[in-house]
Amino acid sequence: LYFSRDAYWEKLYVDQAAGTPLLYVHALRDAPEEVPSFRLGQHLYGTYRTRLHENNWICIQEDTGLLYLNRSLDHSSWEKLSVRNRGFPLLTVYLKVFLSPTSLREGECQWPGCARVYFSFFNTSFPACSSLKPRELCFPETRPSFRIRENRPPGTFHQFRLLPVQFLCPNISVAYRLLEGEGLPFRCAPDSLEVSTRWALDREQREKYELVAVCTVHAGAREEVVMVPFPVTVYDEDDSAPTFPAGVDTASAVVEFKRKEDTVVATLRVFDADVVPASGELVRRYTSTLLPGDTWAQQTFRVEHWPNETSVQANGSFVRATVHDYRLVLNRNLSISENRTMQLAVLVNDSDFQGPGAGVLLLHFNVSVLPVSLHLPSTYSLSVSRRARRFAQIGKVCVENCQAFSGINVQYKLHSSGANCSTLGVVTSAEDTSGILFVNDTKALRRPKCAELHYMVVATDQQTSRQAQAQLLVTVEGSYVAEEAGCPLSCAVSKRRLECEECGGLGSPTGRCEWRQGDGKGITRNFSTCSPSTKTCPDGHCDVVETQDINICPQDCLRGSIVGGHEPGEPRGIKAGYGTCNCFPEEEKCFCEPEDIQDPLCDELCR
C-alpha cells in the first residue's frame, strides 16, 4: 500500500464544530488483495518539526481515510499550541498519517507509507458562505500533485470536494471534471467526485500526465469556472530488462598508437527503459563483470560503467530512460612491442529486474593490439639564421604517427658530427611526442666554418629501447649583426612596436622581436604584445622549450602577478588581456593596459 500524495493541506478555523469533516487521504494498492487501514500519528507538529502537543482534536476513520474534527479547536487550545512553537508565530500545524501495518512506530514520515497533513490556522471563525470566492469554494490553496506506481491495480486517489465547505455551505453547488484527452486512464465520478485510475499505468508509455481540474460554481444564473493544474507522476519500477540498441552486442577495437593507461578502447551501449535503481544505488545494483579470460587481459583491461539518463519518445510524449555505456579501458600503458588479439566478455546484470525474462546481458569486445614500429624520414633539411638567439625554435622532428601517440614515451637526441659546431638542442614535446629543435649555442652559430651543420637524430622508445635514426642537415644563413645596446633579455619587456622590432630577445629565430597587433576587442586572447616569434609565443601554452627560461615567453609561462584587465591562463601565463600586455620576467610581473595611440607618432617626432 502507498499514499497517492506525500502531503495534504486544509484550513482550520477557530471554534469549527466537532464532527466537521476535513479531508480524505487516499491509499493505492500494490496488490489486489490489500486493504488499507489508516492511522494518525499521536502528535501535532509545528514550525521546524517542533512537536507541539498530543493530537486531541483530529481523528481519522481507519477504513475510509476521512479526517474530521473530534472536538472544536478554540482560542485557548490554539494558544496552548502556539506557546510550544519555539517563539515562532503558529500559522501551520501538521499531523502524520500512517498506513497500517506498514509503520507501527511514529518516526520519520517518508512516502510511501506516511503522508503529512498540513492545517493552515485562521484566527477567525469560518467565513460566511456567500463571501467565499469561486477559487475558495473549489480547490485548496496548495495545488496537489499525485504519485501513482506503475503496474499496480487501479484505484481511487483523490476526492475533489472541499469537505468543510460542503459541510457548512450545503446550498452552494459545485461541479468538477477533468480536462483530458481521449483514452487517458483517469475517471472523475460525477456523483462522488472521486478520481480514480481506470487501469494499471505503464511509466514507459507515459510518465507525466499534466491534467487540468475544472470546477464550476453557481453564481446567480451564471457559472464561474476555476481551472487548476492536476499533475500525476507515474513512479517507476524495474520492469524492463536491459537491451542492446539496434541489437549491437559486439564492439571491435584496435589498439595501436593510443596505448596510455585509462584510454577508452571501445564502448558498448545498453539501453534500459527504466530509471530505477536510482543514481545512488545504480552502480551497486547494476553490475558489470569482466569474465575471466587470460591473466594478461584481466590485468590490461577493465570495464567502466557510465550510466546516463536519457529521454525517449513513447506515444507522443517523452519519458525518461537509462543508457548504460560500458567502456573497455586500458588498465596500464602498453608497450609498443605488444601484439595480441583477444575476445573479452562482460556480464551485465540488472539485479533488481524481476522478469519475465532475464535481466542479464553478455557484451563482447574483440580487441587487436598491434605493435608500433618507430620510423623517421631518411633526412631532415632545415635552415637557421646566424642572428638567431638562444632557445629560438627552428623546427620539429617526429617519428611516423607521433601526433597520434599517447602512452608511448619517445625521447629524441642529436648527435653532432662536428664537435665545435654543436649549435642545436632537441627536447621532446609531451603533447605530441615530437622533438622540438632549438638553438642551444649561439657562439657556434656565428663561427664562419659552421655554415652547414650535420646531425644524426635518434628517437628511442623508453620502454623497449627500440630506436629510429635520421640525418639532419642544417644550413646557417645570413650574417651576424650585433644587437643595439640596452635591449632587454626578453622581447616581452617592450611595450611599443618600434622598441620591440629594433631589439632581439631570447627565443627569437631572426634575431629581432616581432610585434603582434591585437584586435582591440576588450579583454581578448588576441592582445597586443612583443614576442620572439608569433608562431609560438604567445599561443596560450607554455611549451617545452619556453619552460627552459622564463624570459622566452612570459606571456605563456609566467607564474607571477598580472596587473590590469586580463584573464589568467591555465595553469599560468595570460589567457586574455586588455590592450597591450608587456612583462618583466625578473620581477615576475606582467601588465595589461589600454593601448597608447599617440605613442608611435611621438616616437617618430622625437627621432
Partner: antibody
C-alpha cells in the same frame, strides 16, 4: 461547432400543455447549463428557467408552478414543459447556452408557439 | 425579483453618431463573489439575440470595439461610439447575478 435547435408543436390549444425539445451538438449537457427564454410577438425577452449542468433547476417566479425543465444527457436534449397555456403564452421560445460566466453566447433559432383555439 | 429598467425605449440616431443606452436595476447586482453579471444583447429583426458585453464591460469575442459597457452597482450604460447600419436593432440588458435573472424591456436603435 456549438449548435442548439428547438423543436415544438407550433400550435397549442388554450389550457393544454406545451412540450419543446432543445437538441444540442458540439458540447455536453453535463458540462454546460441551458436556459429557456421566450419573446411574445413585438415584445421583449423574458427568462423562463434553466437547468444546471448537475441537473438542478431554477424557474421564473411568476411561471414556477406551470414550468418543468429536464434533460437527457445521453441524447443531448433539454426539455421544456409548460402547463395550462393561455393566449398570452404565444411567443417565440428560445433555448440558450450559458458560456460559464460570460452569458448566453449561443442561442437556438427559436420555435414559434401559438396558443389558439 | 430584480427589475431592470432601460431608457430610452427608442433611440433615433444618424449613422456615425454616438449612441448611449442606460440600464438601471432595482437593487445592487453585485454578486457576493464580487462579480457583476450584467450583460448586453442585440436582437436584429427575425434573428436570435447576440451577446455583446458580459460582466459590465467585457466585449464578447468578435464584437467590434465601438461597443463599450460601463457602470457599477445599479447603474449601467452601453455606448456605441460610431453607429453603423448593422448596429440597428433592439438592445437588451440582462442581470444574471440573482436568481431569477431578468431582462430589461429593450431599447430600439433606429435611423433618424
Amino acid at each position: 461547432d456549438v449548435q442548439l435547435q428547438e423543436s415544438g408543436p407550433g400550435l397549442v390549444a388554450p389550457s393544454q400543455s406545451l412540450s419543446i425539445t432543445c437538441t444540442v451538438s458540439g458540447f455536453s449537457l453535463s458540462r454546460y447549463s441551458v436556459h429557456w427564454v421566450r419573446q411574445p410577438p413585438g415584445k421583449g425577452l423574458e427568462w423562463l428557467g434553466m437547468i444546471w449542468l448537475g441537473g438542478s433547476t431554477d424557474y421564473n417566479s411568476a411561471l414556477k408552478s406551470r414550468l418543468s425543465i429536464s434533460k437527457d444527457i445521453s441524447k443531448s436534449q433539454v426539455f421544456l414543459k409548460m402547463n395550462s397555456l393561455q393566449t398570452d403564452d404565444t411567443a417565440m421560445y428560445y433555448c440558450a447556452r450559458n458560456l460559464d460566466s460570460r452569458g448566453f453566447a449561443h442561442w437556438g433559432q427559436g420555435t414559434l408557439v401559438t396558443v389558439s383555439a | 425579483d430584480v427589475l431592470m429598467t432601460q431608457t430610452p425605449l427608442s433611440l433615433p440616431v444618424s449613422l456615425g453618431d454616438q449612441a448611449s443606452i442606460s440600464c438601471r436595476s432595482s437593487q445592487s447586482i453585485v454578486h457576493s463573489n464580487g462579480n457583476t453579471y450584467l450583460e448586453w444583447y442585440l436582437q436584429k429583426p427575425g434573428q436570435s439575440p447576440k451577446l455583446l458585453i458580459y460582466k459590465v464591460s467585457n466585449r464578447f469575442s468578435g464584437v467590434p470595439d465601438r461597443f463599450s459597457g460601463s457602470g457599477s452597482g445599479t447603474d449601467f450604460t452601453l455606448k456605441i461610439s460610431r453607429v453603423e447600419a448593422e448596429d440597428l436593432g433592439v438592445y437588451y440588458c440582462f442581470q444574471g447575478s440573482h436568481v431569477p435573472p431578468t431582462f430589461g424591456g429593450g431599447t430600439k436603435l433606429e435611423i433618424k
